[in-house]
């Protein structure tokens, strides 16, 4: 009876279980009844990071200096290259595909700490009573307008992204 499932680190092909290639190696040919799976090491600038049946290795990531990137950790046959940004610059994402001078805090968040050469902008959510309606790398959350001090009343409640809207008090008619 041919198998319908294989053990870990194996794969099913032509009704038989073949060994997967180990990390750092690619598949050259599937196993047969008489031969083992044939694998070959990845080339100089290539990698595969899992047990696999890939016929091509992946290219190492290129840390483009024109984008402010440099190598943080050189890739191996089993791992991709890790990029980071030049000193004073910050990755735009976890994958670090480009660099920005500093990140901004989105609406609803204020700047807790301005970026330095070492650390990026630190944002904090605007608490109740405060708002931010802009993306900024320096603006803190602003307090809601106090309608009472202007002898007005709140016509529309504020949020973390919007100020309150003040309006005139309703006059009682005689």
């Amino acid at each position: 009876e041919p198998p319908t499932a294989c053990r870990e680190k194996q794969y099913l092909i032509n009704s038989q279980c073949c060994s997967l290639c180990q990390p750092g190696q690619k598949l050259v040919s599937d196993c047969t009844e008489f031969t083992e799976t044939e694998c070959l090491p990845c080339g100089e600038s290539e990698f595969l990071d899992t047990w696999n049946r890939e016929t091509h290795c992946h290219q190492h990531k290129y840390c483009d200096p024109n984008l402010g990137l440099r190598v943080q950790q050189k890739g191996t046959s089993e791992t991709d290259t890790i990029c980071t940004c030049e000193e004073g610059w910050h990755c735009t994402s976890e994958a670090c595909e480009s660099c920005v001078l500093h990140r901004s805090c989105s609406p609803g968040f204020g700047v807790k700490q301005i970026a330095t050469g070492v650390s990026d902008t630190i944002c904090e959510p605007c608490p109740v009573g405060f708002f931010s309606n802009v993306s900024s790398a320096f603006e803190k959350c602003h307090p809601w307008t106090s309608c009472e001090t202007k002898d007005l009343v709140v016509q529309q409640a504020g949020t973390n992204k919007t100020d309150v809207v003040c309006g005139p008090q309703d006059r009682l008619r005689a």
Epitope: N66, L67, G68, C85, E86, W89, T92, S98, C99, V100, L101, H102, R103, S104, V134, S135, S136, A137, F138, E139
Partner: nanobody, 116 residues
Framework: EVQLLESGGGLVQPGGSLRLSCAAS???????EMWWVRQAPGKGLERVS?????????YYADSVKGRFTISRDNSKNTLYLQMNSLRAEDTAVYYC?????????WGQGTLVTVSS
Amino acid sequence: EVQLLESGGGLVQPGGSLRLSCAASGFTFRDYEMWWVRQAPGKGLERVSAINPQGTRTYYADSVKGRFTISRDNSKNTLYLQMNSLRAEDTAVYYCAKLPQLFQDWGQGTLVTVSS
């Protein structure tokens, strides 16, 4: 293509003044928060000053507070930095930057040297 062209740097004596300009093109200048950042010889980047898109809110690093004034003219797509009471420690290359500022859009900067 985003372009930021800084000018106005030069050699000035301690206590003197300079006005830096930054001509912006390739983006809608009036929509962006703008920054002045400097790099002293052998040092890291220091964020000096910032201004919101409308020019109504500003930020100054403690090291320049009361001496530097940031401003902008949205009709001319230009950012300014008025620097008074200059000190030797203000010697640096000054760059203007938009938010967000990608590395590849970074300008050449303008060198300010404060020396007697």
